[in-house]
């Protein structure tokens, strides 16, 4: 059990107060993390509280300002990037968000040697992406869907691509679906390790159907937003990968990297690019039916100035029980011989583990094993491999950092974090300097987050980077809910759950229950992390019990649980939430007449289906920006788990798994449906169709739309949303205002 105490430091309990909704909406109890911006093995940059950019040297213990807040303010910079040769800094301003990762900005180059901005050949605006080369101070940037190169910031640019066109051809940046569902980045270009070559993707969206929605704004007529967006079964983007020599870019121009024959024979995706050396690159490809992935290692042929990808350097990863990989296919981490690599994929027992591939995948050497999963490989050095897993004490919702000594035989394993701050810290990530000389650990909970700096050889803690002292003090007089993480064993399935209990919880009393669900494939909600959020308030102030349950389809507990939902979305995720609720009722402290469920996005889909399950368990529920039919969602995501919506594939389940098909079943529940009209991700269409089906079935329901808001419902909409949902739940549970 992980309990978060109420922290009663004062004998007079009346000095303690419950959380308020205002606390949550104001972000009163938000925490800070510290991720060093590493610039060498022993130096990092950090933006100070007063906005100076400060260089810290761990070994000398010295720090000094390299860029003043005055310079930052002179161009209203909100971000910066130091060139690897330390000559220049780019300053980023006029940030304008596009989709989840993408944004445009204005960039200024500041010369640190002279203490002034570079004049002449200034960068155009707005720029879609800009980055330094890994060595020196070359610049690559994307402007109006074309890629440009500068040898030095003051030089005129060299235009690499010319065919870029809004919503048609994207060079060096992903289109909507690649950004959201495949790359999870705003960029699609990659420098080779020493900056000799630049690789980039070209996405051709010419034939993709367009989603169009109104953006109301303030004008007399609304604008129409058009996004090439392939829904399940629709025409997909066509991707090509090119590499250009940045030293002599005009010599032969961009050279296309060949696609493996077994991939090119039908629709396919490019999934990632990893440079190995300046003249060796690794590309990963995926069939449209996403159970076959090919990793292809390609070499530069000096004589022909082309890239050669021999079949002997093709490694196939295939899943027979589900899709390839977890959420994404994992990426390789190459070792110093520049041909062998480490990679996470399923072992014979169906658990994701680290494997070492020297020649073929069939001959892979398994590095980790057990009924737990390796989650991320952080760094491979000559003698150590650092990774995270959920092995420790068999809690799948924890993350600890491990070091495997690969320089010695047999390799020895050490948990770096397991016993550091055991009660406070059970969920870590890490950030490594060059050669893993030093690293930062960022602990997310279950206690108050803390960031620390460590020696990469001894693992010794050097200093605390951020310990959230102010937050700790602010929470001293707050009655926080108690949290426990436990598991239910039901029909050979383990259902881990997190229960958030009111501060004065008494097992002999009855409490209203709210289920918070996400439940999407390869997600995890039950995590040992710190949070003071809306559900904390509902437990603290309103006396609700809140539960989160990880059912079938969720991650990091083996392929049996993960792939259980393959081709059957909307069935087992819902069943497992219902099963858990029945178990919670059996515990004796739940008022079974006051049970609600809510979720956002995939969670909105699951909560809607749970409400319409006909069990009579739920009195009410909320769906925020739900998917309502898998035919409405993005091809890359949907087809990964559902196959194609065609008669000879999986159309029947596409049709059976809609929320609309269950409209009649909403008659006996109170349903609140919420969506942003400018949702580029889960289109408003989804909720429009639910509403239409409910109206056609003459079923009463409540709804709220947020004009011109996207999938995140940010800004003032957030406050309105949570206030509205609070009123709805309090009314449902007969709680006084």
């Amino acid at each position: 059990i992980v309990l978060r105490p109420s922290r009663v430091h004062n004998s007079e309990e009346n000095t303690m107060r419950a959380l308020t909704l205002k606390d949550i909406l104001n972000g009163t109890f938000s925490y800070k993390t510290f991720f060093p911006n590493w610039i060498s093995g022993q130096e990092y940059l950090h933006q100070s509280a007063d906005n100076n950019i400060v260089l810290y040297n761990i070994e000398t213990g010295q720090s000094y300002t390299i860029l003043s807040n005055r310079t930052m303010k002179s161009v209203n910079a909100s971000n910066y990037g130091l060139s690897p040769d330390r000559q220049f800094v780019y300053l980023e301003s006029d940030y304008s968000k596009l989709w989840r990762y993408s944004y445009t900005a204005t960039y200024y180059i500041y010369d640190l040697s002279n203490g002034e901005f570079v004049r002449g050949n200034e960068l155009p605006r707005p720029i879609q992406y800009l980055c330094w080369s890994p060595v020196g101070s070359k610049l690559a940037y994307v402007y109006q869907n074309n890629i440009y190169l500068k040898q030095r910031p003051g030089d005129p640019p060299f235009q690499i691509t010319f065919n870029g066109r809004e919503n048609k051809i994207f060079n060096g940046i992903p289109d909507w679906v690649y950004e959201e569902e495949m790359l999870a980045t705003k960029y699609a270009l990659w420098w080779s390790p020493n900056g000799k070559f630049l690789a980039y993707a070209e996405f051709n969206d010419t034939d993709i159907p367009v989603i169009a929605y109104s953006y109301y704004g303030d004008e007399q007529y609304p604008r129409t937003i058009n996004i090439p967006y392939p829904k399940a079964g629709a025409k997909n983007p066509v991707v090509r990968i090119f590499i250009i020599d940045t030293t002599y870019p005009a010599y032969v121009g961009p050279q296309e990297v060949p696609v493996p024959a077994m991939i090119a024979s039908s629709d396919y995706y490019f999934s990632w690019l990893t440079w190995v050396t300046d003249e060796r690159v690794c590309l990963q490809w995926l069939k449209r039916v996403q159970n076959v992935s090919v990793l292809s290692i390609c070499d530069f042929r000096e004589d022909w100035q082309t890239w050669d990808c021999p079949k002997t350097q093709e490694h196939i990863e295939e899943s027979r029980t589900g899709w390839a990989g977890g959420f994404f296919v994992s990426t390789p981490v190459f070792s110093y011989d520049a041909i062998s690599y480490y990679k996470i994929f399923s072992d014979k027992d169906g658990y994701k583990h680290i494997h070492y591939i020297k020649d073929t995948v069939e001959n892979a050497i398994q590095i980790t094993s057990g009924k737990w999963e390796a989650i991320n490989i952080f760094r491979v050095t000559q003698d150590s491999l650092f990774y995270s897993s959920n092995e420790f004490e068999e809690y799948p919702g924890r993350r600890n950092i491990y070091r495997i000594s690969i320089g010695s035989y047999p390799p020895s394993k050490k948990c770096v974090t397991c016993h550091l701050r055991k009660e406070r810290c059970q969920y870590y990530t890490a950030s490594f300097s060059d050669y893993a000389k030093y690293y930062a650990l960022v602990c997310y909970g279950p206690g108050i987050p803390i960031s620390t700096l460590h020696d990469g050889r001894t693992d010794q803690e050097i200093k605390i980077l951020e310990e959230n002292k102010e937050l700790e003090n602010a929470l001293k007089n707050i009655q926080l809910p108690k949290e426990e993480i436990k598991k239910l064993e039901v029909d050979e399935i383990t259902l881990w759950y997190k229960m958030i209990l009111p501060p004065q919880f008494d097992r002999s009393k009855k409490y209203p229950l709210l289920i918070q669900v996400y439940g999407g494939p390869c997600s995890q909600s039950v995590r040992s992390v710190f949070a003071v959020n809306w559900i904390s308030y509902l437990a603290s102030k309103e006396g609700m019990v809140i539960a989160l349950v990880d059912g079938r389809g969720t991650a990091f507990q083996g392929d049996k649980l993960l792939y259980a939902v393959y081709r059957k979305l909307g069935v087992y995720e819902v069943e497992d939430q219902i099963t858990a609720v029945r178990k919670f009722i059996e515990m004796g402290f739940i008022d079974e007449k006051r049970i609600a469920i809510w979720g956002w996005s995939y969670g909105g889909y699951v909560s809607s289906l749970a409400l319409a399950s006909g069990t009579g368990l739920f009195k009410c529920g909320i769906a925020v920006a739900p998917v309502s039919s898998w035919e409405y969602y993005a091809s890359v995501y949907t087809e990964r788990f559902m196959g194609l919506p065609t008669k000879d594939d999986n159309l029947e389940h596409y049709k059976n798994s809609t929320v609309m098909a269950r409209a009649e079943y909403f008659r006996n529940v109170d349903y609140l449906l919420i969506h942003g009209t400018a949702d580029d991700n889960v289109h408003f269409q989804n909720s429009a169709q639910i509403a239409k089906a409910l109206v056609n079935a003459q079923v009463d329901f409540q709804a709220m739309w947020y004009s011109d808001q996207n999938h995140g419902l940010s800004g003032l909409s957030t406050n309105h949303l949570y206030t509205h949902m609070t009123h709805f739940l309090k009314q449902c549970f007969s709680l006084s205002d």
């Epitope: 060498s40 093995g41 022993q42 130096e43 100076n52 260089l55 040297n57 070994e59 000398t60 213990g61 010295q62 000094y64 300002t65 390299i66 860029l67 003043s68 310079t71 130091l82 330390r86 000559q87 640190l112 040697s113 203490g115 000389k437």
Partner: nanobody, 116 residues
């Protein structure tokens, strides 16, 4: 405040060599990352070479393969060995932190003149 004293400049013929030194005082700790910079007449100051506290070096493209930066932590001194000098290397050479600190703290530099 750190004091920087550059020396070793002079007049040399094209193809010749020079070794510049930079004595760092006022700093008790080990040397931070240090760099050499230069300013030619009528031009802006530019970075030439850098060495970090782990002795990892980096060079501007126009001097790569000809110049070598090194350091002696015991003497708190940074060096720049300049070989195969060209007339375009003529400039006042400065040493400083790499990158320089704010506000900048430049020494008086040392003049290098390369005749053809």
């Amino acid at each position: 405040q750190v004091q920087l004293q550059e020396s070793g400049g002079g007049l040399v013929q094209a193809g010749g060599s020079l070794r510049l030194s930079c004595a760092v005082s006022g700093s008790t700790a080990r040397l931070d990352a240090m760099g050499w910079y230069r300013q030619a007449p009528g031009k802006q100051r530019e970075w030439v070479a850098g060495i970090d506290s782990a002795d990892i070096t980096d060079y501007a493209r126009f001097v790569k393969g000809r110049f070598t930066i090194s350091r002696d932590n015991a003497k708190n001194t940074v060096y720049l060995q300049m070989n195969s000098l060209k007339p375009e290397d003529t400039a006042v050479y400065y040493c400083n932190k790499w990158p320089p600190s704010v506000p900048p703290n430049w020494g008086q530099g040392t003049q290098v003149t390369v005749s053809s």
